[in-house]
Amino acid sequence: MAERAALEELVKLQGERVRGLKQQKASAELIEEEVAKLLKLKAQLGPDESKQKFVLKTPKGTRDYSPRQMAVREKVFDVIIRCFKRHGAEVIDTPVFELKETLMGKYGEDSKLIYDLKDQGGELLSLRYDLTVPFARYLAMNKLTNIKRYHIAKVYRRDNPAMTRGRYREFYQCDFDIAGNFDPMIPDAECLKIMCEILSSLQIGDFLVKVNDRRILDGMFAICGVSDSKFRTICSSVDKLDKVSWEEVKNEMVGEKGLAPEVADRIGDYVQQHGGVSLVEQLLQDPKLSQNKQALEGLGDLKLLFEYLTLFGIDDKISFDLSLARGLDYYTGVIYEAVLLQTPAQAGEEPLGVGSVAAGGRYDGLVGMFDPKGRKVPCVGLSIGVERIFSIVEQRLEALEEKIRTTETQVLVASAQKKLLEERLKLVSELWDAGIKAELLYKKNPKLLNQLQYCEEAGIPLVAIIGEQELKDGVIKLRSVTSREEVDVRREDLVEEIKRRTGQPLCIC
């Protein structure tokens, strides 16, 4: 009992501490940590039925999607899927959880963000962190050496997300990957072309795709004097250059990661450079970098890549950026990341900062990690950060006060007089059977005004009105909701007339 009282006091004190920190506007990380402590204390306290007030909410970092948000999401997915299919991709799916062993050692410093599941009868399981590692596992398991596939599914990360910026703990990824032995840089160029096609089609604003190569990074670190064991950790520091100044990055590398200041300065001379193919040419002439085998290979491939990107007509969207050092351990060659240059916002509004909206790269060693003989299957791919894109599209539509239809109903079957429910049911059934998207109000005798109002609200373009006289004449009154114009259509021609007016193909193929 004394222990419970002590815990209750600690919960109270910790609650006061959290409130105090919020009032003092302490750092977000400190508040987050103290809130996490409070939750752990409460968990130890366990339920006290007399006090327990269950707050109905979704777990941290997750959200529900309203019909309006789903409509936006489906439009975005449609653009992406059509592009993937246009490029000849097949589709696969994999389990939402994998054996923990499958995911271990693939994500470097990000491994701490993997969700582990509680005991599942002996198997140690984790929720998938991305779609790439499961894809590599799928290739190795099925002994596939050649596939072009896309996969759209939810992934899970135990992050501390800023949900306002389109970041979550459960979120969709849309991945496109090409696996197989091909001539250099052709699949890589196609991935960048796909990325640009999708981002252009979505009309979310001007974007830039930053490109680098893991081999150039590794070669650069080697000639600057970074020990092999520090490559990955220094990479994660360099990758922060898009968010913080070089000074801060240098301080982290020297102060926290134990790098000598002169080594950091040498790295700084390289990683602060960005440009186009001319920068590639310049670095090929660099007396130190050109002597490094890895860097030389990477630069040679990038030169070739820029040739193909020019042929694809997207070289103006690409920037060779030496600070790009994507955090995942499995990249081996070209890496890329698309960022929005500015996000559309109302005049006088703060632009929505959403960072990276797509990313990817080459990972030639990942499949080999799963193969007992270490056989490699070269792979290159991209991932579209759709959650961030949803946030931008939603914000844009809100700013424009644009009405989004959340259903696809083409026609409402209505009646002008009482006692016509049976006739409405018969007609709506005929329309459904003919492939027409139709609805009716679930009332025996609805008022015509209410039925028309329902169409206005739901954005239904047409109303098929049944009346006593129309039944005798064998016609249906077809009314346009927006123009209010009405025409009598012979019952047998109704399906064809609705399809004509809504632009639907005349046969359901």
Epitope: L13, Q44, K112
Partner: antibody, heavy 120, light 107 residues
């Protein structure tokens, strides 16, 4: 019962490195914040560093920040302190300690300590 | 950083005496204060946390009080095993700091 056993101490020259380990048993290690606390010979106690249950949060006292790194391996029930660029003033008995009620910054269980001597 | 100042730095007392040690924080720390006992060559032992809560297994002759900046540890009737050094520690904000210690000696 709760047991914390430190190891890895010893004599090291200034500028050198040492890695301290702490083996934990008798409790669910992965539920607890853990810390390193030191005591220079004949002196008071100094809280050096802490790490949260799943390694999300770490912190260091100013005098060691950038030189020491705290880490843990929950699968092995182990806590570590990597000490680089050691100085004479780092000479102390280093204690591994467990947080009270998992998250309260009060050490309710301590190891026996391991002596680190930095001297040329 | 929050400074913790203990007084007295040493105290001589006899078995059966009532002893009070005080600890002052350089800024308000609510009730985030703990008291430890340390004997030579041993690790410290937790006596009291959040100013007044007795750690399980600690004799009831030990008690703590205070909040904000001023705190006291009281031993109501000294026993032979109580002769040791006592430290206070603030757990309000990092870096968590200890007092310089109060040595309790036999008179």
């Amino acid at each position: 019962q709760v047991q914390l056993v430190e190891s890895g101490g010893g004599l090291v020259k200034p500028g050198g490195s040492l890695r301290l380990s702490c083996a934990a048993s008798g409790f669910t290690f992965s539920d607890y914040y853990m810390s390193w606390i030191r005591q220079a010979p004949g002196k008071g106690l100094e809280w050096v560093s802490y790490i949260s249950d799943s390694s999300t949060y770490t912190n260091y006292t100013d005098s060691v920040r950038g030189r020491f790194t705290i880490s843990r391996d929950n699968a092995k029930n182990s806590l570590y302190l990597q000490m680089n660029s050691l100085r004479a003033e780092d000479t102390a008995v280093y204690y591994c300690a467990r947080y009270l009620y998992q998250v309260i910054a009060v050490a309710d269980s301590w190891g026996q300590g391991t002596l680190v001597t930095v001297s040329s | 950083d929050i400074q913790m100042t203990q007084s007295p730095s040493s105290v001589s007392a006899s078995v059966g005496d009532r002893v009070t040690i005080t600890c002052r924080a350089s800024q308000g720390i609510s009730s985030w204060l703990a008291w430890f006992q340390q004997k030579p060559g041993k690790a410290p032992k937790l006596l009291i946390y959040v100013a007044s809560n007795l750690e399980s297994g600690v004799p009831s002759r030990f008690s703590g009080s205070g909040s904000g900046t001023d705190f006291t540890l009281t031993i109501s009737s000294l026993q032979p095993e109580d002769f040791a050094t006592y430290y206070c520690q603030q757990a309000n904000s990092f870096p968590y700091t200890f007092g310089q210690g109060t040595k309790l000696e036999i008179k």
